[in-house]
Amino acid sequence: EVEKTACPSGKKAREIDESLIFYKKWELEACVDAALLATQMDRVNAIPFTYEQLDVLKHKLDELYPQGYPESVIQHLGYLFLKMSPEDIRKWNVTSLETLKALLEVNKGHEMSPQVATLIDRFVKGRGQLDKDTLDTLTAFYPGYLCSLSPEELSSVPPSSIWAVRPQDLDTCDPRQLDVLYPKARLAFQNMNGSEYFVKIQSFLGGAPTEDLKALSQQNVSMDLATFMKLRTDAVLPLTVAEVQKLLGPHVEGLKAEERHRPVRDWILRQRQDDLDTLGLGLQG
Protein backbone atom coordinates (compact mmCIF):
# COMPACT_ATOMS: atom_id res chain seq x y z
CA GLU A 1 0.00 0.00 0.00
CA VAL A 2 1.40 3.36 -1.07
CA GLU A 3 1.30 6.13 1.53
CA LYS A 4 -0.62 9.32 0.75
CA THR A 5 1.88 12.14 0.31
CA ALA A 6 1.50 15.55 -1.33
CA CYS A 7 2.74 15.90 -4.90
CA PRO A 8 5.93 18.00 -5.07
CA SER A 9 5.57 21.37 -6.74
CA GLY A 10 5.73 21.23 -10.53
CA LYS A 11 5.40 17.46 -10.67
CA LYS A 12 1.63 17.13 -11.16
CA ALA A 13 1.09 15.02 -14.30
CA ARG A 14 -0.72 16.88 -17.08
CA GLU A 15 -0.65 13.83 -19.32
CA ILE A 16 0.55 10.26 -19.27
CA ASP A 17 3.99 10.44 -20.85
CA GLU A 18 7.55 9.21 -20.48
CA SER A 19 8.50 11.75 -17.85
CA LEU A 20 6.58 9.54 -15.41
CA ILE A 21 9.16 6.77 -15.81
CA PHE A 22 11.46 8.73 -13.52
CA TYR A 23 8.86 9.20 -10.79
CA LYS A 24 9.31 7.21 -7.60
CA LYS A 25 6.40 5.06 -6.47
CA TRP A 26 5.11 7.65 -4.01
CA GLU A 27 5.39 10.42 -6.61
CA LEU A 28 3.33 8.45 -9.11
CA GLU A 29 0.72 7.90 -6.42
CA ALA A 30 0.63 11.55 -5.44
CA CYS A 31 0.98 13.20 -8.84
CA VAL A 32 -1.02 11.10 -11.30
CA ASP A 33 -4.77 11.57 -11.34
CA ALA A 34 -6.68 8.29 -11.71
CA ALA A 35 -9.20 9.80 -14.14
CA LEU A 36 -6.35 11.11 -16.33
CA LEU A 37 -4.79 7.64 -16.31
CA ALA A 38 -8.10 6.04 -17.32
CA THR A 39 -8.65 8.42 -20.24
CA GLN A 40 -5.08 7.98 -21.50
CA MET A 41 -4.74 4.23 -21.00
CA ASP A 42 -3.85 3.82 -24.66
CA ARG A 43 -0.48 5.46 -23.87
CA VAL A 44 0.44 3.30 -20.88
CA ASN A 45 1.71 0.26 -22.73
CA ALA A 46 3.94 2.36 -24.97
CA ILE A 47 5.70 3.78 -21.92
CA PRO A 48 8.37 1.54 -20.33
CA PHE A 49 7.15 1.69 -16.76
CA THR A 50 9.06 -0.56 -14.40
CA TYR A 51 7.36 -3.64 -13.04
CA GLU A 52 7.37 -1.85 -9.68
CA GLN A 53 5.56 1.20 -11.08
CA LEU A 54 2.79 -0.97 -12.50
CA ASP A 55 1.62 -1.57 -8.90
CA VAL A 56 0.84 2.12 -8.49
CA LEU A 57 -1.00 2.34 -11.80
CA LYS A 58 -3.14 -0.64 -10.83
CA HIS A 59 -3.85 0.90 -7.43
CA LYS A 60 -5.07 4.07 -9.19
CA LEU A 61 -7.42 2.15 -11.47
CA ASP A 62 -8.73 0.08 -8.55
CA GLU A 63 -9.65 3.25 -6.68
CA LEU A 64 -11.43 4.68 -9.71
CA TYR A 65 -13.25 1.46 -10.62
CA PRO A 66 -13.91 -0.54 -7.42
CA GLN A 67 -16.64 -2.54 -9.17
CA GLY A 68 -14.35 -3.57 -12.01
CA TYR A 69 -12.73 -1.85 -15.00
CA PRO A 70 -14.71 -0.90 -18.11
CA GLU A 71 -13.65 -2.57 -21.36
CA SER A 72 -12.28 0.75 -22.66
CA VAL A 73 -9.62 0.46 -19.93
CA ILE A 74 -9.18 -3.31 -20.07
CA GLN A 75 -8.32 -3.30 -23.77
CA HIS A 76 -5.31 -1.06 -23.08
CA LEU A 77 -3.96 -2.76 -19.94
CA GLY A 78 -1.08 -4.46 -21.73
CA TYR A 79 1.57 -5.45 -19.19
CA LEU A 80 -0.59 -4.11 -16.38
CA PHE A 81 -2.57 -7.34 -16.86
CA LEU A 82 0.31 -9.13 -15.10
CA LYS A 83 -0.68 -7.36 -11.90
CA MET A 84 -4.33 -8.44 -11.99
CA SER A 85 -5.64 -11.20 -9.75
CA PRO A 86 -8.36 -13.68 -10.71
CA GLU A 87 -10.60 -11.78 -8.26
CA ASP A 88 -10.02 -8.55 -10.20
CA ILE A 89 -10.79 -10.25 -13.49
CA ARG A 90 -14.05 -11.77 -12.21
CA LYS A 91 -15.39 -8.21 -11.97
CA TRP A 92 -14.80 -7.59 -15.68
CA ASN A 93 -17.10 -7.94 -18.64
CA VAL A 94 -14.90 -8.58 -21.68
CA THR A 95 -16.86 -8.88 -24.93
CA SER A 96 -14.36 -7.94 -27.63
CA LEU A 97 -12.12 -10.59 -29.15
CA GLU A 98 -9.53 -7.86 -29.78
CA THR A 99 -9.40 -7.12 -26.06
CA LEU A 100 -8.94 -10.82 -25.31
CA LYS A 101 -6.11 -11.08 -27.87
CA ALA A 102 -4.36 -8.00 -26.46
CA LEU A 103 -4.33 -9.47 -22.95
CA LEU A 104 -3.29 -12.96 -24.07
CA GLU A 105 -0.37 -11.39 -25.94
CA VAL A 106 1.15 -10.28 -22.62
CA ASN A 107 1.40 -13.90 -21.40
CA LYS A 108 2.36 -15.26 -24.82
CA GLY A 109 4.63 -18.28 -24.75
CA HIS A 110 3.94 -19.06 -21.09
CA GLU A 111 1.64 -21.73 -19.76
CA MET A 112 -1.83 -20.63 -18.77
CA SER A 113 -1.96 -18.61 -15.55
CA PRO A 114 -4.96 -18.53 -13.19
CA GLN A 115 -5.52 -14.97 -14.42
CA VAL A 116 -5.69 -16.05 -18.06
CA ALA A 117 -7.91 -19.01 -17.21
CA THR A 118 -10.33 -16.67 -15.41
CA LEU A 119 -10.27 -14.19 -18.30
CA ILE A 120 -11.04 -16.92 -20.85
CA ASP A 121 -13.79 -18.35 -18.67
CA ARG A 122 -15.43 -14.92 -18.32
CA PHE A 123 -15.13 -14.26 -22.04
CA VAL A 124 -16.53 -17.62 -23.19
CA LYS A 125 -19.40 -17.53 -20.66
CA GLY A 126 -20.23 -14.02 -21.85
CA ARG A 127 -20.45 -15.23 -25.44
CA GLY A 128 -22.54 -18.24 -24.51
CA GLN A 129 -20.57 -20.61 -26.71
CA LEU A 130 -17.07 -21.25 -27.99
CA ASP A 131 -17.38 -19.80 -31.50
CA LYS A 132 -14.84 -20.40 -34.26
CA ASP A 133 -13.01 -17.06 -33.96
CA THR A 134 -12.63 -17.45 -30.20
CA LEU A 135 -11.42 -21.02 -30.52
CA ASP A 136 -9.01 -19.95 -33.26
CA THR A 137 -7.57 -17.30 -30.95
CA LEU A 138 -7.37 -19.49 -27.86
CA THR A 139 -5.72 -22.45 -29.57
CA ALA A 140 -3.22 -20.09 -31.27
CA PHE A 141 -2.07 -18.92 -27.82
CA TYR A 142 -2.69 -22.18 -25.95
CA PRO A 143 -2.60 -25.28 -28.19
CA GLY A 144 -3.77 -27.45 -25.29
CA TYR A 145 -6.76 -25.24 -24.49
CA LEU A 146 -9.42 -27.52 -25.93
CA CYS A 147 -8.20 -30.49 -23.90
CA SER A 148 -8.35 -28.44 -20.71
CA LEU A 149 -12.15 -28.26 -21.01
CA SER A 150 -14.49 -30.77 -19.43
CA PRO A 151 -16.75 -32.89 -21.70
CA GLU A 152 -19.65 -30.73 -20.48
CA GLU A 153 -17.88 -27.53 -21.54
CA LEU A 154 -16.92 -29.08 -24.87
CA SER A 155 -20.55 -29.83 -25.58
CA SER A 156 -21.10 -26.09 -26.14
CA VAL A 157 -18.56 -26.02 -28.98
CA PRO A 158 -20.50 -25.65 -32.24
CA PRO A 159 -19.44 -27.99 -35.11
CA SER A 160 -18.45 -24.96 -37.19
CA SER A 161 -15.70 -24.17 -34.64
CA ILE A 162 -14.04 -27.53 -35.26
CA TRP A 163 -12.50 -26.12 -38.44
CA ALA A 164 -10.17 -24.07 -36.24
CA VAL A 165 -8.75 -27.16 -34.49
CA ARG A 166 -5.26 -28.36 -35.43
CA PRO A 167 -3.99 -31.91 -34.71
CA GLN A 168 -1.62 -30.63 -31.99
CA ASP A 169 -4.57 -29.00 -30.20
CA LEU A 170 -5.87 -32.49 -29.38
CA ASP A 171 -2.60 -34.01 -28.17
CA THR A 172 -3.57 -34.03 -24.51
CA CYS A 173 -7.28 -34.84 -24.91
CA ASP A 174 -8.53 -37.97 -23.17
CA PRO A 175 -11.10 -40.42 -24.65
CA ARG A 176 -14.04 -38.75 -22.88
CA GLN A 177 -13.21 -35.44 -24.52
CA LEU A 178 -12.76 -37.02 -27.94
CA ASP A 179 -16.13 -38.77 -27.51
CA VAL A 180 -17.68 -35.30 -27.43
CA LEU A 181 -15.54 -33.76 -30.16
CA TYR A 182 -15.71 -36.59 -32.70
CA PRO A 183 -19.42 -36.29 -33.61
CA LYS A 184 -18.96 -32.54 -34.01
CA ALA A 185 -15.97 -33.10 -36.31
CA ARG A 186 -17.91 -35.70 -38.32
CA LEU A 187 -20.67 -33.17 -38.83
CA ALA A 188 -18.28 -30.33 -39.64
CA PHE A 189 -16.37 -32.30 -42.29
CA GLN A 190 -19.28 -34.30 -43.72
CA ASN A 191 -19.23 -32.64 -47.13
CA MET A 192 -15.55 -33.35 -47.83
CA ASN A 193 -14.41 -36.11 -50.16
CA GLY A 194 -12.81 -39.34 -48.88
CA SER A 195 -9.10 -38.53 -48.66
CA GLU A 196 -9.59 -34.89 -47.55
CA TYR A 197 -12.15 -36.03 -44.99
CA PHE A 198 -9.73 -38.54 -43.50
CA VAL A 199 -6.96 -35.95 -43.16
CA LYS A 200 -9.31 -33.68 -41.20
CA ILE A 201 -11.05 -36.35 -39.08
CA GLN A 202 -7.90 -38.34 -38.26
CA SER A 203 -6.97 -36.51 -35.05
CA PHE A 204 -10.55 -36.89 -33.71
CA LEU A 205 -10.80 -40.65 -34.31
CA GLY A 206 -10.14 -41.47 -30.65
CA GLY A 207 -13.85 -40.82 -30.26
CA ALA A 208 -15.03 -42.85 -33.27
CA PRO A 209 -17.44 -45.82 -32.89
CA THR A 210 -16.91 -49.21 -34.55
CA GLU A 211 -19.31 -48.56 -37.43
CA ASP A 212 -17.36 -45.47 -38.49
CA LEU A 213 -14.08 -47.39 -38.39
CA LYS A 214 -15.64 -50.11 -40.52
CA ALA A 215 -16.77 -47.47 -43.01
CA LEU A 216 -13.28 -45.95 -43.12
CA SER A 217 -11.78 -49.38 -43.80
CA GLN A 218 -13.64 -49.40 -47.12
CA GLN A 219 -11.98 -46.16 -48.24
CA ASN A 220 -8.25 -47.02 -48.59
CA VAL A 221 -7.29 -44.50 -45.91
CA SER A 222 -3.99 -46.11 -44.79
CA MET A 223 -4.29 -45.11 -41.14
CA ASP A 224 -0.92 -44.84 -39.37
CA LEU A 225 -0.20 -46.86 -36.25
CA ALA A 226 -0.04 -43.79 -33.99
CA THR A 227 -3.65 -42.99 -34.88
CA PHE A 228 -4.73 -46.63 -34.55
CA MET A 229 -3.21 -46.84 -31.06
CA LYS A 230 -5.37 -43.90 -29.95
CA LEU A 231 -8.64 -45.54 -31.03
CA ARG A 232 -11.14 -46.64 -28.39
CA THR A 233 -10.52 -50.27 -27.44
CA ASP A 234 -14.25 -50.99 -27.46
CA ALA A 235 -14.46 -49.61 -31.02
CA VAL A 236 -11.52 -51.68 -32.28
CA LEU A 237 -12.45 -55.07 -30.74
CA PRO A 238 -15.34 -55.89 -33.13
CA LEU A 239 -13.22 -55.19 -36.25
CA THR A 240 -12.28 -58.24 -38.32
CA VAL A 241 -8.72 -58.98 -39.41
CA ALA A 242 -9.68 -58.05 -42.97
CA GLU A 243 -11.12 -54.71 -41.81
CA VAL A 244 -8.02 -53.83 -39.80
CA GLN A 245 -5.84 -54.80 -42.75
CA LYS A 246 -7.82 -52.48 -45.03
CA LEU A 247 -7.88 -49.73 -42.44
CA LEU A 248 -4.09 -49.74 -41.94
CA GLY A 249 -3.07 -50.60 -45.50
CA PRO A 250 0.75 -50.69 -45.71
CA HIS A 251 0.97 -49.77 -42.01
CA VAL A 252 -0.47 -53.15 -40.97
CA GLU A 253 3.08 -54.46 -40.43
CA GLY A 254 3.36 -52.10 -37.46
CA LEU A 255 0.91 -54.27 -35.50
CA LYS A 256 3.75 -56.63 -34.62
CA ALA A 257 5.66 -53.95 -32.72
CA GLU A 258 2.51 -53.00 -30.81
CA GLU A 259 1.19 -56.51 -30.10
CA ARG A 260 1.65 -56.12 -26.32
CA HIS A 261 -0.10 -52.74 -26.11
CA ARG A 262 -3.76 -51.78 -26.06
CA PRO A 263 -5.85 -51.76 -28.16
CA VAL A 264 -3.78 -54.12 -30.38
CA ARG A 265 -3.24 -56.70 -27.60
CA ASP A 266 -6.94 -56.93 -26.77
CA TRP A 267 -7.92 -57.04 -30.45
CA ILE A 268 -5.47 -59.89 -31.19
CA LEU A 269 -6.94 -61.96 -28.36
CA ARG A 270 -10.39 -61.62 -29.93
CA GLN A 271 -9.33 -62.96 -33.35
CA ARG A 272 -9.15 -66.49 -34.69
CA GLN A 273 -5.55 -67.64 -35.14
CA ASP A 274 -6.26 -68.65 -38.75
CA ASP A 275 -7.35 -65.10 -39.54
CA LEU A 276 -4.31 -63.59 -37.81
CA ASP A 277 -2.03 -65.90 -39.80
CA THR A 278 -3.29 -64.37 -43.06
CA LEU A 279 -1.41 -61.19 -42.08
CA GLY A 280 1.90 -63.08 -42.04
CA LEU A 281 3.15 -61.10 -39.05
CA GLY A 282 3.47 -63.92 -36.55
CA LEU A 283 0.77 -62.51 -34.27
CA GLN A 284 -0.33 -65.00 -31.60
CA GLY A 285 -3.95 -64.87 -30.42
Epitope: E18, P48, T50, Y51, E52, Y79, N107, H110, S113
Partner: antibody, heavy 116, light 107 residues
Framework: EVQLVESGGGLVQPGGSLRLSCAAS????????IHWVRQAPGKGLEWVAS????????LYADSVKGRFTISADTSKNTAYLQMNSLRAEDTAVYYC?????????WGQGTLVTVSS | DIQMTQSPSSLSASVGDRVTITCRAS??????VAWYQQKPGKAPKLLIG???LLYSGVPSRFSGSGSGTDFTLTISSLQPEDFATYYC?????????FGQGTKVEIK
Protein backbone atom coordinates in the same frame (compact mmCIF):
# COMPACT_ATOMS: atom_id res chain seq x y z
CA GLU B 1 9.64 -17.46 -36.47
CA VAL B 2 11.29 -14.92 -34.16
CA GLN B 3 15.02 -14.48 -34.72
CA LEU B 4 17.72 -12.11 -33.54
CA VAL B 5 21.09 -12.07 -35.29
CA GLU B 6 24.04 -10.08 -33.94
CA SER B 7 27.00 -8.96 -36.01
CA GLY B 8 29.87 -6.48 -35.81
CA GLY B 9 32.04 -8.09 -33.15
CA GLY B 10 35.78 -8.52 -33.50
CA LEU B 11 39.20 -7.58 -32.15
CA VAL B 12 39.75 -3.94 -31.25
CA GLN B 13 42.47 -2.04 -29.41
CA PRO B 14 41.82 -0.31 -26.06
CA GLY B 15 40.30 3.11 -26.72
CA GLY B 16 38.87 1.92 -30.03
CA SER B 17 35.29 1.69 -31.25
CA LEU B 18 32.92 -0.97 -32.59
CA ARG B 19 29.31 -0.95 -33.72
CA LEU B 20 27.24 -4.04 -33.07
CA SER B 21 24.02 -4.75 -34.99
CA CYS B 22 21.04 -6.86 -33.97
CA ALA B 23 18.81 -7.73 -36.92
CA ALA B 24 15.34 -8.88 -35.90
CA SER B 25 12.90 -10.96 -37.92
CA UNK B 26 9.53 -12.54 -37.15
CA UNK B 27 8.37 -9.50 -35.14
CA UNK B 28 8.60 -5.71 -35.29
CA UNK B 29 11.00 -4.14 -32.82
CA UNK B 30 8.89 -1.02 -32.25
CA UNK B 31 6.42 -3.15 -30.28
CA UNK B 32 9.10 -4.60 -28.00
CA UNK B 33 12.10 -3.68 -25.90
CA ILE B 34 15.55 -4.68 -27.13
CA HIS B 35 18.42 -5.28 -24.70
CA TRP B 36 22.14 -5.88 -24.96
CA VAL B 37 23.49 -8.34 -22.40
CA ARG B 38 27.14 -9.34 -22.24
CA GLN B 39 29.09 -12.25 -20.83
CA ALA B 40 32.81 -12.00 -20.15
CA PRO B 41 34.77 -15.24 -20.69
CA GLY B 42 33.88 -17.72 -17.93
CA LYS B 43 31.64 -15.18 -16.18
CA GLY B 44 27.93 -14.55 -15.70
CA LEU B 45 25.42 -12.39 -17.56
CA GLU B 46 25.56 -8.61 -17.27
CA TRP B 47 22.84 -6.31 -18.60
CA VAL B 48 24.38 -3.49 -20.67
CA ALA B 49 21.68 -1.35 -22.25
CA SER B 50 18.03 -1.30 -23.33
CA UNK B 51 15.97 0.57 -25.90
CA UNK B 52 12.24 0.90 -26.36
CA UNK B 53 12.22 1.65 -30.11
CA UNK B 54 8.60 2.86 -30.16
CA UNK B 55 9.62 5.86 -28.08
CA UNK B 56 13.40 5.84 -28.37
CA UNK B 57 13.70 5.61 -24.58
CA UNK B 58 17.11 4.21 -23.55
CA LEU B 59 18.77 2.88 -20.40
CA TYR B 60 22.41 2.04 -19.63
CA ALA B 61 24.40 0.17 -17.02
CA ASP B 62 26.70 2.46 -15.03
CA SER B 63 29.71 0.56 -16.35
CA VAL B 64 29.05 1.71 -19.95
CA LYS B 65 27.26 5.04 -19.46
CA GLY B 66 28.80 7.78 -21.60
CA ARG B 67 30.77 5.29 -23.71
CA PHE B 68 28.08 3.10 -25.28
CA THR B 69 25.01 4.23 -27.23
CA ILE B 70 22.04 2.01 -28.01
CA SER B 71 19.84 2.93 -30.95
CA ALA B 72 17.29 1.39 -33.30
CA ASP B 73 16.20 1.77 -36.90
CA THR B 74 12.60 0.57 -37.04
CA SER B 75 12.55 0.72 -40.85
CA LYS B 76 15.37 -1.87 -40.88
CA ASN B 77 14.00 -3.70 -37.82
CA THR B 78 17.49 -3.51 -36.37
CA ALA B 79 19.00 -2.35 -33.08
CA TYR B 80 22.58 -1.16 -32.63
CA LEU B 81 25.16 -0.78 -29.90
CA GLN B 82 27.82 1.83 -30.62
CA MET B 83 30.77 1.14 -28.32
CA ASN B 84 33.42 3.83 -27.90
CA SER B 85 36.46 4.14 -25.61
CA LEU B 86 36.60 0.39 -25.28
CA ARG B 87 38.48 -1.16 -22.36
CA ALA B 88 39.92 -4.61 -21.73
CA GLU B 89 37.06 -5.29 -19.29
CA ASP B 90 34.54 -4.85 -22.12
CA THR B 91 35.81 -8.10 -23.65
CA ALA B 92 32.78 -10.40 -23.80
CA VAL B 93 30.21 -12.12 -25.93
CA TYR B 94 27.46 -9.57 -26.57
CA TYR B 95 23.91 -10.85 -26.92
CA CYS B 96 20.85 -8.93 -27.99
CA UNK B 97 17.57 -10.05 -26.50
CA UNK B 98 13.93 -9.06 -26.71
CA UNK B 99 11.28 -8.49 -24.07
CA UNK B 100 9.71 -5.81 -21.92
CA UNK B 101 10.66 -7.44 -18.62
CA UNK B 102 11.88 -11.02 -19.09
CA UNK B 103 13.87 -11.84 -22.24
CA UNK B 104 12.13 -14.48 -24.31
CA UNK B 105 14.34 -14.50 -27.40
CA TRP B 106 18.12 -14.13 -27.63
CA GLY B 107 20.57 -13.90 -30.50
CA GLN B 108 23.53 -16.27 -30.82
CA GLY B 109 25.95 -13.60 -29.59
CA THR B 110 28.94 -11.83 -31.12
CA LEU B 111 32.40 -11.82 -29.53
CA VAL B 112 34.12 -8.51 -28.78
CA THR B 113 37.79 -8.72 -27.81
CA VAL B 114 39.55 -5.59 -26.55
CA SER B 115 43.28 -6.13 -26.54
CA SER B 116 46.49 -4.50 -27.65
CA ASP C 1 20.88 -1.50 -7.67
CA ILE C 2 19.17 -4.70 -6.57
CA GLN C 3 21.65 -7.53 -6.03
CA MET C 4 20.63 -11.09 -6.91
CA THR C 5 22.58 -13.75 -5.06
CA GLN C 6 22.32 -17.34 -6.23
CA SER C 7 23.23 -20.41 -4.24
CA PRO C 8 24.96 -22.66 -4.61
CA SER C 9 27.32 -21.29 -7.26
CA SER C 10 27.83 -24.86 -8.47
CA LEU C 11 26.53 -28.31 -7.64
CA SER C 12 27.17 -31.89 -8.70
CA ALA C 13 24.19 -34.16 -9.18
CA SER C 14 23.20 -37.41 -10.85
CA VAL C 15 20.51 -38.12 -13.41
CA GLY C 16 17.22 -38.55 -11.55
CA ASP C 17 18.19 -36.29 -8.64
CA ARG C 18 15.98 -33.48 -7.39
CA VAL C 19 17.87 -30.21 -7.73
CA THR C 20 17.03 -26.90 -6.05
CA ILE C 21 18.63 -23.56 -6.89
CA THR C 22 17.87 -20.50 -4.81
CA CYS C 23 18.06 -16.82 -5.63
CA ARG C 24 17.91 -14.07 -3.01
CA ALA C 25 17.19 -10.44 -3.85
CA SER C 26 18.76 -7.67 -1.76
CA UNK C 27 15.32 -6.05 -1.51
CA UNK C 28 11.68 -6.93 -2.20
CA UNK C 29 11.06 -7.56 -5.91
CA UNK C 30 7.54 -9.04 -5.48
CA UNK C 31 7.27 -11.68 -8.22
CA UNK C 32 9.45 -9.86 -10.76
CA VAL C 33 11.93 -12.66 -11.35
CA ALA C 34 12.78 -14.75 -14.43
CA TRP C 35 14.94 -17.86 -14.79
CA TYR C 36 17.23 -18.85 -17.66
CA GLN C 37 19.24 -21.89 -18.68
CA GLN C 38 22.53 -21.55 -20.55
CA LYS C 39 24.63 -24.29 -22.09
CA PRO C 40 28.32 -23.74 -23.01
CA GLY C 41 28.76 -21.68 -26.17
CA LYS C 42 25.01 -21.02 -26.47
CA ALA C 43 22.71 -18.13 -25.70
CA PRO C 44 20.59 -18.25 -22.55
CA LYS C 45 17.09 -19.73 -22.87
CA LEU C 46 14.08 -18.50 -20.95
CA LEU C 47 12.63 -21.09 -18.54
CA ILE C 48 10.24 -18.96 -16.49
CA GLY C 49 9.32 -15.34 -17.19
CA UNK C 50 6.10 -14.68 -15.32
CA UNK C 51 5.63 -15.71 -11.70
CA UNK C 52 5.93 -19.51 -11.64
CA LEU C 53 4.78 -20.12 -15.23
CA LEU C 54 6.91 -22.27 -17.50
CA TYR C 55 7.81 -20.88 -20.90
CA SER C 56 6.75 -22.91 -23.93
CA GLY C 57 8.79 -26.01 -24.61
CA VAL C 58 10.18 -26.14 -21.06
CA PRO C 59 9.66 -29.62 -19.56
CA SER C 60 7.31 -29.91 -16.57
CA ARG C 61 10.13 -31.23 -14.36
CA PHE C 62 11.15 -27.56 -14.00
CA SER C 63 9.25 -25.40 -11.55
CA GLY C 64 9.66 -22.00 -9.98
CA SER C 65 8.41 -20.55 -6.71
CA GLY C 66 8.88 -17.64 -4.36
CA SER C 67 8.11 -13.95 -4.04
CA GLY C 68 9.52 -10.98 -2.17
CA THR C 69 13.21 -11.72 -1.72
CA ASP C 70 13.50 -15.52 -1.91
CA PHE C 71 13.06 -17.52 -5.11
CA THR C 72 13.62 -21.14 -6.05
CA LEU C 73 14.08 -23.05 -9.28
CA THR C 74 13.54 -26.79 -8.88
CA ILE C 75 14.28 -29.64 -11.28
CA SER C 76 12.27 -32.59 -9.96
CA SER C 77 14.24 -35.30 -11.76
CA LEU C 78 17.47 -34.19 -13.41
CA GLN C 79 17.92 -35.31 -17.02
CA PRO C 80 21.19 -35.45 -19.04
CA GLU C 81 20.15 -32.39 -21.06
CA ASP C 82 19.67 -30.33 -17.87
CA PHE C 83 23.40 -30.05 -17.10
CA ALA C 84 23.93 -26.33 -17.66
CA THR C 85 24.25 -22.99 -15.87
CA TYR C 86 21.10 -21.38 -14.49
CA TYR C 87 20.55 -17.66 -13.93
CA CYS C 88 17.86 -15.67 -12.15
CA UNK C 89 17.02 -12.11 -13.23
CA UNK C 90 15.04 -9.44 -11.42
CA UNK C 91 13.03 -7.10 -13.63
CA UNK C 92 11.21 -5.30 -10.82
CA UNK C 93 13.34 -2.18 -10.97
CA UNK C 94 16.00 -0.70 -13.23
CA UNK C 95 18.65 -1.70 -13.85
CA UNK C 96 17.62 -5.30 -14.43
CA UNK C 97 20.16 -7.54 -12.70
CA PHE C 98 21.16 -11.18 -12.97
CA GLY C 99 22.35 -13.62 -10.36
CA GLN C 100 25.93 -14.84 -10.75
CA GLY C 101 24.72 -18.24 -12.01
CA THR C 102 24.55 -21.79 -10.70
CA LYS C 103 26.43 -24.43 -12.64
CA VAL C 104 24.83 -27.89 -12.50
CA GLU C 105 27.45 -30.54 -13.23
CA ILE C 106 27.38 -34.33 -13.56
CA LYS C 107 28.46 -36.13 -10.40
Amino acid sequence: EVQLVESGGGLVQPGGSLRLSCAASGFTIDKEAIHWVRQAPGKGLEWVASIYPHSGFTLYADSVKGRFTISADTSKNTAYLQMNSLRAEDTAVYYCARGRYWMDYWGQGTLVTVSS
Amino acid sequence: DIQMTQSPSSLSASVGDRVTITCRASQDVEDGVAWYQQKPGKAPKLLIGIKDLLYSGVPSRFSGSGSGTDFTLTISSLQPEDFATYYCQQYYRWPSTFGQGTKVEIK
